[in-house]
């Protein structure tokens, strides 16, 4: 007997689709080996139709896929647009050839069944309503009209024109006629449930001259739509329940044995497991809404249902839509820490991943807010200016091509704690989230700027120093001038070869920035920071105010244009083997963001079109040069 297991018989009808799951034993070899689906011919040969190596036969082109779920030890073959030609014997199996471990599957595709001509079939989804049309002859116009439901022995009254209504249809069934047409009556039944399915007879008149019509009402549970998503990516449940429930509260719930536990609804309920990574967005007035979940976890896999009811809870007889979500652990989205810790007054540098194939996409950073239905207003973006309340302390550094951009937030307060999302206007699967935790600082910051109350005098020379600990010696130090389009790194070049000294004097490690001469445009926020290659570390910020020179102060001759601003970077040289990676704050954003929010992001990006990306030249009118001096103490 084969250790592979699956459905022995699969039957469907033309135009439908099948999803065949094959189970394999839990071994590392099995998880990584080739998976295939082949069709058995009369000769016993099995011709590959699709395999996990990327092969897809011509007859399956555009209508089939094969997905491996190594964490579940399963693979799934999805085939759409079935025809009777698909009827046959197949194998699902593992191995480099089609003679490996396999399981026989018989697939039968039949024609759509013909319906008896004397019966009118109504097919409706659960929770919807049906209007049954009952024609009759003129002579039965004055007679009683009725609809009854067939049971084993009799036909049980549903409703009649004398206003008799079966108790289980009270408030749900209506018998009426339209306009002046005296040859048809109608029965409307709302909030359909499974129990309403069956055969009905509508009748006008009594005895042999009565008009009768057979009706077959089929009430379908909605098909669960299959969703295959990668670990750490995001999923959007698009729910379209129809205009009749447009004004009802909406919900998304997850099946749990006998109940469906609400994850989020429009009345403000939200499952704590989804805190920081879920949004519910009403789309329009037609009952359409969507729920976005980001940072997918393995345990998010399952059976989801959306619906509408005034209670915001699942209710029988109300429309629903269902999905079966699979979460594939073989994910292209890098695994990063999902929690970043900072301290008050300190800074964090958050590395946001994006699809490396989309390096030119616009990058954004937003803060998830849970009030109401949840939303994520953009705080900064490659073409979106920094929000006012983040002036001087937030910047986005785009590093084209390497699949990461960095967001730096400094001057942290406890109010900054919360959930943030990294997103782009490109591949929506790469939305990621991080939780920022901010603790009260218990020691001095690693980077300190002096003087702290910086006021520079117009036309004079002004120097600020940034003190850093020995552990940052081997890292690159930089100063940048902040603007709401980014933090423009001030250029520098190293004029002396690095030397090392045995001891490290904590008090003498500093990098200085000199403005010479000071101009009005120099006013603003400046950051001192450390980085290693493209990996940004800690930063600290200082605001430099520029004042007119007071009387009696010495006059400084303006220097030539090239030397108007000089940034002198001075460093104490220490043993480069000391390098602690502390407080690196490279998080694991777990993917997210909402379509509508992204749309808004796009609109905002249009409004705030900047001349250059954050981290590149920000259009300053002055050039800066810098020198690297090494002092030995």
């Amino acid at each position: 007997k084969s250790p592979i297991f699956g459905p022995q018989e699969v039957s469907s009808i033309e135009g439908d689709s099948v999803s065949i799951t094959c189970y394999y034993p839990d071994t590392s070899v099995n998880r990584h080996t080739r998976k295939y689906w082949c069709r058995q011919g009369a000769s016993g040969m099995c011709t590959t139709l699709i395999s996990s190596n990327g092969y897809l036969s011509k007859e399956y082109s555009g209508r089939a896929n094969l997905i491996n779920f190594p964490e579940n030890n399963t693979f799934v073959i999805n085939i759409e647009q079935l025809t009777q030609d698909d009827t046959g014997s197949y194998k699902c199996g593992l191995g480099t050839s089609n003679r490996g471990l396999s399981f026989d599957v018989s697939l039968e595709v039949s024609q759509v069944p013909e319906l008896p001509s004397d019966t009118h079939v109504y097919t409706k989804d659960i929770g919807r309503n049906v209007t049954i049309e009952c024609p009759f002859k003129r002579e039965n116009a004055p007679s009683k009209k009725s609809l009854c439901k067939k049971t084993n022995q009799s036909c049980e009254l549903v409703i009649d024109s004398t206003e008799k209504v079966n108790p289980s249809y009270i408030g749900r069934a209506k018998l009426f006629m339209k306009g002046t047409d005296l040859t048809v009556f109608y029965v409307n039944i709302s909030h359909l449930t499974h129990n309403d399915a069956g055969l009905y007879i509508c009748q006008a008149g009594e005895g042999p001259s009565a008009d009768k019509k057979n009706v077959d009402l089929q009430v379908l549970a909605p098909e669960p739509e299959l969703l295959y998503k990668d670990l750490r990516s995001s999923v959007t449940f698009e729910c379209d329940l129809g205009r009749e429930v447009a004004n009802e509260a909406k919900y998304l719930c997850r099946m749990n044995k006998e109940t469906c536990d609400v994850i989020i609804n429009t009345l403000g309920k939200r499952d704590p497991d989804f805190e920081g990574r879920i949004l519910i967005t009403p789309k329009d007035d037609n009952g359409r809404f969507s729920v976005l979940i980001t940072g997918l976890r393995k345990e998010d896999a399952g059976h989801y249902q959306c619906g509408a009811h005034s209670s915001g809870l699942p209710q029988e007889g109300w429309p629903i839509q269902t999905w079966q979500l699979f979460v594939n652990e073989e994910s292209t989205i890098p695994n990063r820490r999902s929690v970043v810790k900072g301290v008050t007054g300190g800074s964090v540098a958050i590395a946001c991943p994006y699809n490396p194939k989309e390096s030119s996409s616009l990058k954004y950073w937003c803060r998830w807010e849970g009030d109401g239905n949840g939303h994520c207003p953009v705080l900064v973006g490659t073409q979106a200016q920094v929000q006012e309340e983040y002036e001087g302390r937030l910047a986005l550094f785009d590093q084209p091509g390497n699949g990461t951009y960095t967001v730096i937030l400094n001057q942290l307060t406890t109010e900054d704690a919360g959930f943030y999302w990294c997103l782009t206007n490109g591949d929506s699967r790469w939305r990621t989230t991080i939780e920022l935790q901010v603790a009260e600082a218990t020691r001095e910051p690693n980077l300190e700027v002096t003087p702290q109350n910086a006021t520079a005098v117009l036309g004079e020379t002004f120097t600020v120093s940034c003190h850093y600990p020995c552990k940052f010696y081997s890292q690159e130090k930089y100063w940048c001038k902040w603007s709401n389009k980014g933090c423009h790194i001030l250029p520098s070049h190293d004029e002396g070869a690095r030397q090392s000294s045995v001891s490290c004097d904590q008090s003498s490690q500093l990098v200085s920035m000199t403005l010479n001469p000071v101009s009005k445009e120099d006013e603003g926020w400046y950051w001192c920071g450390v980085k290693q290659g493209q990996t940004y570390g800690e930063t600290t910020a200082i605001y430099i105010a520029v004042e007119e020179r007071t009387r009696g102060s010495s006059h400084v001759n303006p220097t030539d244009a090239n030397a108007r601003a000089k940034v002198a970077l001075e460093e104490e040289v220490v043993d480069s083997s000391i390098s602690e990676k502390e407080n690196k704050a490279i998080p694991n954003p777990g993917p997210f963001a909402n379509e509508r929010e992204i749309q808004n992001v796009g609109d905002q990006a249009q409004e705030n079109r900047a001349s250059g990306d954050a981290g590149s030249a920000d259009g300053q009118s002055r050039s800066s040069s810098s020198k690297h001096h090494h002092h030995h103490h």
């Epitope: 699969v10 469907s12 669960p224």
Partner: nanobody, 126 residues
Framework: EVQLVESGGGLVQAGDSLRLSCAAS????????MGWFRQAPGKEREFVAT??????????YYADSVKGRFTISRDNAKNTVYLQMNSLKPEDTAVYYC?????????????????WGQGTLVTVSS
């Protein structure tokens, strides 16, 4: 709540046939699979057959020990699942339980089923 009621068990000779029925009632909205398990005296409950459905598509799963002899089917309108057992053997003697649930994972696993019937006894004498 879903209620499952089995019927059709009894005493038969080896080689004979028997048809078991399982009728589901109640909130069957999220039931996408129904199946049969059996438990012989002193043994663990084991998978026999399951039928899963999705719209007009049916998936039938069988244990190796019953392949070719047992057939599972369902009547959608009646919310009923049947197990046609042919060529019965003495080793098929057991209490047969009907099970139902969303069955999103492996249909051979007991935990995939949310609801269980009381069981019907099938005895096959040699």
């Amino acid at each position: 709540e879903v209620q499952l009621v089995e019927s059709g068990g009894g005493l038969v000779q080896a080689g004979d046939s028997l048809r078991l029925s399982c009728a589901a009632s109640g909130r069957t909205l999220t039931t996408y699979g129904m199946g049969w398990f059996r438990q012989a005296p002193g043994k663990e409950r084991e998978f026999v057959a399951t039928i899963k459905w999705s719209g007009s598509t049916n998936y039938k799963y069988y244990a190796d020990s019953v392949k070719g002899r047992f057939t599972i089917s369902r009547d959608n309108a009646k919310n009923t699942v049947y197990l046609q057992m042919n060529s019965l053997k003495p080793e098929d003697t057991a209490v047969y339980y009907c099970a139902a649930g969303t069955v999103l994972g492996d249909p051979r696993v007991l935990n995939e089923y949310d609801y269980w019937g009381q069981g019907t006894l099938v005895t096959v004498s040699s």
